[in-house]
Interface confidence: medium
Amino acid sequence: ESRAELTSDKDMYLDNSSIEEASGVYPIDDDDYASASGSGADEDVESPELTTSRPLPKILLTSAAPKVETTTLNIQNKIPAQTKSPEETDKEKVHLSDSERKMDPAEEDTNVYTEKHSDSLFKRTE
């Protein structure tokens, strides 16, 4: 199961496994979270680093994207986009199931596209 990269500014987790075992590296933001030694302030920073190096989970909570004829939702980040290879761009697509569209009528105008074979909001491209 592969997942799109997480563009987070929270590196509050340390890896206690090998590179192969770990599922991702959260971008480091020393001002936000303590270092491995446990020191550091807990304060928000407005310009997050975007240094993801391995696939990380991403659920489809995105700003409204222009409607296109597609069955996938392209996650759009409000942080200035980085140049991506076609492979990286493909990772950004998130598949949704029909069941996830059974929402309150007020939410039906949200820009979510469905794909029959995919089973969940959080599930990534297999």
Partner: antibody, heavy 123, light 107 residues
Framework: EVQLVETGGGVVQPGRSLTLSCGAS????????MHWVRQAPGKGLEWVAV????????YYGDSVKGRFTISRENIKNTLYLQMNSLRSEDTAVYYC????????????????WGQGTMVTVSS | AIRMTQSPSSLSASVGDRVTITCRAS??????LAWFQQKPGEAPKSLII???RLKSGVPSRFSGSGSGTEFALTISSLRPEDFATYYC?????????FGGGTKVEIK
């Protein structure tokens, strides 16, 4: 200190409505997806709902779909949970929690939790 | 929904003991698993995400392992402050689901 404070809990009769609020401080609230998670007395944790950083996307746990509505006012740094058609099984401590991810990204897990507010549904 | 099964549901241990809690997912979730600690009357506290990644400030005696359907949280040498209830949570598939919890009590 990064903080979340829930308010609005109390005792309510079955079938009635209640709105919970969660005030955020010391972080840029508008950058984060936010969740509600609940815990019935003596029981485990149950995810209730999530809302995107800008409020455009909302998703719910099966047991509350169609009855609960999650919303947010970023200008007020406040998250809400409107609970309608309350049932006895909705009795729980309700926690708001910040998603680990920032911006349009949300991971589906949580780093910062509030202290919780108790909701009791009883006639 | 994916069912998360924790075992044991409770255990008694002594300070200094090595404790392992397991969490099984009803279907594969990759490494998208988190562990939380909760003490009575308090909110849960994040310990680990992505199955193995320890939150800064959490003592290194806590470690996570596993992927797919089988996961474990290990406390290498139990301290008095570690007596609490521990929950696993999967975030690969909606709806997000938690394990039933494991209560670690003083022997």
């Amino acid at each position: 200190e990064v903080q979340l404070v829930e308010t609005g809990g109390g005792v309510v009769q079955p079938g009635r409505s209640l709105t919970l609020s969660c005030g955020a401080s010391e972080f840029t609230f508008s950058n984060y997806a936010m969740h509600w998670v609940r815990q019935a007395p003596g029981k485990g944790l149950e995810w209730v709902a999530v809302i995107s950083y800008d409020g455009t996307k909302k998703y719910y746990g099966d047991s509350v779909k169609g009855r609960f509505t999650i919303s947010r006012e970023n200008i007020k740094n406040t998250l809400y949970l409107q609970m309608n058609s309350l049932r006895s099984e909705d009795t729980a401590v309700y926690y708001c929690a910040r998603d680990v991810g920032k911006g349009v990204t949300a991971t589906g897990t949580f780093d910062i939790w509030g202290q919780g507010t108790m909701v009791t549904v009883s006639s | 929904a994916i069912r998360m099964t924790q075992s044991p549901s409770s255990l008694s241990a002594s300070v200094g003991d090595r404790v392992t809690i397991t969490c099984r997912a009803s279907q594969g979730i990759g490494s998208y698993l988190a562990w939380f600690q909760q003490k009575p009357g308090e909110a849960p506290k994040s310990l680990i995400i992505d199955a193995t990644r320890l939150k800064s400030g959490v003592p290194s005696r806590f470690s996570g392992s596993g992927s797919g359907t089988e996961f474990a949280l290990t406390i290498s040498s139990l301290r008095p402050e570690d007596f609490a209830t521990y929950y696993c949570q999967q975030y690969n598939v909606s709806p997000l689901t938690f394990g039933g919890g494991t209560k670690v009590e003083i022997k």
